[in-house]
Interface confidence: low
């Protein structure tokens, strides 16, 4: 495939990445799959500057990001190291709360209304943000 030189239509370019902001809600798994179908991934926040950019675009709305601990440790969907990376959790979060009565704990991270992060039940249908890097090769469809 060839290297992307500009963002797809309806995507926003910022610091060599392209971002797409949903206006509907999906469960985390569906949002994750949506981004993958777009040859992208749920947003991975690597700096305070990127946090502010995303926060500005989503407003005070619960919004999924590409961070989860469904297999144990917290992981970013693109493999970015969680332990050494940027974090912006709300106080006392993540708490893997079981008291919601919905079964299980809380395994997926989202931006809250103030932009800080919370872990929540992955089935909640929140908005989401997809991200893809301009410097990565795009997937050309195979010739049939």
């Amino acid at each position: 495939g060839s290297e992307r030189t500009c963002c797809p239509v309806n995507w926003v370019e910022h610091e060599r990445s392209c971002y797409w902001f949903s206006r509907s809600g999906k469960a985390w798994a569906d949002a994750d799959n949506y981004c993958r179908l777009e040859d992208a991934h749920l947003v991975v926040v690597t700096s305070w500057e990127e946090q502010k950019f995303v926060q500005h675009h989503i407003g005070p709305v619960n919004t999924w990001m590409g961070l989860h601990d469904q297999n144990g440790p917290w992981k970013w969907v693109d493999g970015t190291d969680y332990e050494t990376g940027f974090k912006n959790w709300r106080p006392e979060q993540p708490d893997d709360w079981y008291g919601h009565g919905l079964g299980g704990g809380e395994d997926c991270a989202h931006f809250t209304d103030d932009g800080r992060w919370n872990d929540d039940v992955c089935q909640r249908p929140y908005r989401w943000v997809c991200e893809t890097e301009l410097d990565k090769a795009s997937q050309e469809p195979p010739l049939l």
């Epitope: 809600g25 798994a29 919905l102 395994d107 929140y126």
Partner: antibody, heavy 116, light 113 residues
């Protein structure tokens, strides 16, 4: 024990409106997502709409989008479905259901008949 | 939308015999990150609302007799009644809750032969 009781069904003319209610008890209503599901006479189940625990997120099936509105009042432990521009094909038993890994509790349903 | 299909449309089973119902989804309902299939099975008896039997494709809801079991992964699923009882006469539905809108199969009617 968990109980869901629907009300508000009845006979309505095409183009008319109805508001269904679902009274919940026996669980912490504000912790749960809720759905409306319907079943036309002699037919299968059709999932219609879904509302988050706080009421901030809603979703509709295409068949009712723009005509039906789901809402909730957590202080009253109640779920609602406002149905406008009703059509003959909306005739069905309407169920409210507590939503999680599937719908684990259902009401007994309320019958809506749309006919002139 | 994910389309759910079921087979057969109906079946008649002798008391004590095994009943098998198949459900197929138009796309996978398996989420690889947690290895769970977002599929449920319901039983609906005449004049009653549906009753949740199985969730996560194979986990029995509390209070459901162990003669009911669910299996399968991805797009192909099965509900099995290991020993048919008179009270099992009902219509059985599968439902995916992986992708909004959640969708049901058309149902399989199970009777006593």
């Amino acid at each position: 024990q968990v109980q869901l009781v629907e009300s508000g069904g009845g006979l309505v003319k095409p183009g008319g409106s109805l508001r269904l209610s679902c009274a919940a008890s026996g669980f912490t209503f504000s912790d749960y997502y809720m759905s409306w599901i319907r079943q036309a006479p002699g037919k299968g189940l059709e999932w219609l709409s879904y509302i988050s625990s706080s009421g901030t997120t809603v979703f509709y099936a295409d068949s009712v989008k723009g005509r039906f509105t789901i809402s909730r009042d957590n202080a009253k432990n109640s779920l609602y479905l406002q149905m406008n521009s009703l059509r003959a094909e909306d005739t069905a038993v309407y169920y409210c259901a507590r939503e999680w890994v599937g719908a684990d509790y259902w009401g007994q349903g309320t019958l809506v008949t749309v006919s002139s | 939308d994910i389309v759910m299909t079921q087979s057969p449309d109906s079946l008649a089973v002798s008391l004590g015999e095994r009943a098998t119902i198949n459900c197929k989804s138009s796309q996978s309902v398996l989420f690889n990150s947690n290895n769970k299939n977002y599929l449920a099975w319901y039983q609906q008896k005449p004049g009653q609302p549906p009753n949740l039997l199985i969730y996560w494709a194979s986990t029995r809801e509390s209070g459901v007799p162990d003669r009911f079991s669910g299996s399968g992964s991805g797009t192909d699923f099965t509900l099995t009644i290991s020993s048919m009882q008179a009270e099992d006469v009902a219509v059985y539905y599968c439902q995916q809750y992986c992708s909004l809108p959640f969708t049901f199969g058309p149902g399989t009617k199970v009777d006593i032969r």
